[in-house]
Amino acid sequence: IWELKKDVYVVELDWYPDAPGEMVVLTCDTPEEDGITWTLDQSSEVLGSGKTLTIQVKEFGDAGQYTCHKGGEVLSHSLLLLHKKEDGIWSTDILKDQKEPKNKTFLRCEAKNYSGRFTCWWLTTISTDLTFSVKSSRGSSDPQGVTCGAATLSAERVRGDNKEYEYSVECQEDSACPAAEESLPIEVMVDAVHKLKYENYTSSFFIRDIIKPDPPKNLQLKPLKNSRQVEVSWEYPDTWSTPHSYFSLTFCVQVQGKSKREKKDRVFTDKTSATVICRKNASISVRAQDRYYSSSWSEWASVPCS
Amino acid sequence: RNLPVATPDPGMFPCLHHSQNLLRAVSNMLQKARQTLEFYPCTSEEIDHEDITKDKTSTVEACLPLELTKNESCLNSRETSFITNGSCLASRKTSFMMALCLSSIYEDLKMYQVEFKTMNAKLLMDPKRQIFLDQNMLAVIDELMQALNFNSETVPQKSSLEEPDFYKTKIKLCILLHAFRIRAVTIDRVMSYLNAS
């Protein structure tokens, strides 16, 4: 058993049929010694008396808010949560496996630049009685500070018969140099509590590996005289690290109709313009990627050909 | 401790081409190592990230773009003195700070070159003959060092009398390649910045 925060405790349980469970001793936070009784949640049934209460925690029915009272007055609370371990593996029931980039990916993180700011998100089908708490650091043995905000519900989607909820959090490394060469990864830890179930999820990464630039901005077309070719130009996204001559991007320019299976014109360039063949009912799209360290491509920025 | 916006001679800054080749060569070599050593811990997640140049050179700080010198987190207190007669830019226009940066890059390359050559000598003794260093990568390191053209004491190649542990050598190769790729990215960024200045 360990303390998650004040008056909230996590009991780690091996979860299998007829498991013996864990013996837990609760102590009432009071100078009083006599006349103390214990109850669980809203029940008025007295579970025991005395300054300490010893319980055998085996299942969710044994978890909850234990309260010690004296003469009708509440003295203190202890909330017990369960953390299940099945076949030596901690449960991951609360969050959905996003399976990208690999199986057992519960947290996904992205950074728009090298400033040390990044966003992580996760998915769940649970809509109520759900809380998240996020901590982060650079390295684990001698951790350096990363400050994370509160996790917020950022999107709701319908997937078949189920509703899916996306939560996200923004974090900022306290003293980040965009040009630095990372040797210690960022560690992100998410505590998830659903009703009386506790789970924790972690992710470890280098900012350089989670870079995904914003799409290029200000796409403009200039038809070339006596030709089907069009000169398309664009600019670096505002959110990208500066100077751009140091933090350079490379671009992919594509002309394609509405369907992915349609024919296309595609060219890669390090410049902020390119010449392509425009077709009726097609769109010109441009996306960006770090020129020197191949992490993710940005989303496409598009303009119609006509 | 940073790169001022200098005005190099017009035309292609000669080291830019070499640095692009360097990044390409080390990336290819790292990819080859990951594939060949698939049953060794050779991915970014599996290895310890070590920098053999730590406390010996300070390329990131010495080559910091002017725009980042206002960022407190980028200014490191480490001071290292470097030889200052580089030839990637016309000598008259090579400022002291830029020479400091380029000589730091040269020292990095020299250190990695020695490590790679020592390691290759060990890998050549491996009866499995599983992996060797790409000669192209070693040649590209050499070309960039020549383009930088710094005079510096030659570092003797480390020789070891004990029987090499090939497993450890291959893991060390992965660690070295990962670190060198990161440094090659920095070098490419620096050369691109200098070329645009």
Partner: antibody
């Protein structure tokens, strides 16, 4: 299976024209760009131009501009390349090629040898 | 027009050994570079697209690398069926242009 089948070999006199055909099978004809590339005996490859069969748009290499005409007939899934004012240096194997990507070729025809000789 | 220069023009190789062919562009073409294989009396066949993207059905011993002006086609271990002529082609701008070809011959 995508296939491009070209017309047979031709022998032409200098100053005349030649029209080579290329019939496509497998996949929708207008879903692909069609190119013509030639190869003189013992020489390398030379790109001549492309057509978008969907709308008839064409682009030619400056070297052939005014001498080459590429057309397409959607009803028969056939593309044509006509080269006029033939000279001896036009002796070559002419390939049609196609791809959903405009700028390179993932399938090429078997080639048509055009010999220009007096 | 962008000029593509291949080297060497002829490459004698022992079967089972690796082979590397170089292609250089007269100006930077990013990764807009494709490789083809042509055997005598046959049409060219696409091997690699956009400098390093493998093509389905092409053996994994063929790999490509490079960007900007310098590109390499590598055959990790030459098989008897790999003896052929190899061409690079740029798609950075029209007109599309090819290298002069590299003939890989049995040593």
């Amino acid at each position: 299976q995508v296939q491009l089948v070209q017309s047979g070999a031709e022998v032409k006199k200098p100053g005349s024209s030649v029209k080579v055909s290329c019939k496509a099978s497998g996949g929708t004809f207008s879903d692909y760009y069609l190119h013509w590339v030639r190869q003189a005996p013992g020489q390398g490859l030379e790109w001549m131009g492309w057509i978008d069969p969907e709308n008839g748009d064409t682009e030619y290499a400056p070297k052939f501009q005014g001498r080459v005409t590429i057309t397409a007939d959607e009803s028969t899934s056939t593309a044509y390349m006509e080269l006029s004012s033939l000279r001896s240096e036009d002796t070559a194997v002419y390939y049609c090629a196609r791809n959903k990507e405009l700028r390179y070729f993932d399938v090429l025809g078997q080639g048509t040898l055009v010999t220009v000789s007096s | 027009d962008i000029v593509m220069t291949q080297s060497p023009l002829s490459l004698p190789v022992t079967p089972g050994e690796p082979a590397s062919i170089s292609c250089r562009a007269s100006q930077s073409i990013s990764i807009n570079l494709h490789w083809y294989q042509q055997k005598p009396g046959q049409q060219p066949r696409l091997l690699i697209a956009f400098a390093s993207q493998s093509i389905s059905g092409v053996p994994s011993r063929f790999s490509g690398s490079g960007s900007g002006t310098d590109f390499t086609l590598t055959i990790s271990s030459l098989q008897p069926e790999d003896f052929a002529t190899y061409y690079c082609q740029q798609s950075n701008s029209f007109p599309l242009t090819f290298g002069q070809g590299t003939k890989v011959e049995i040593k």
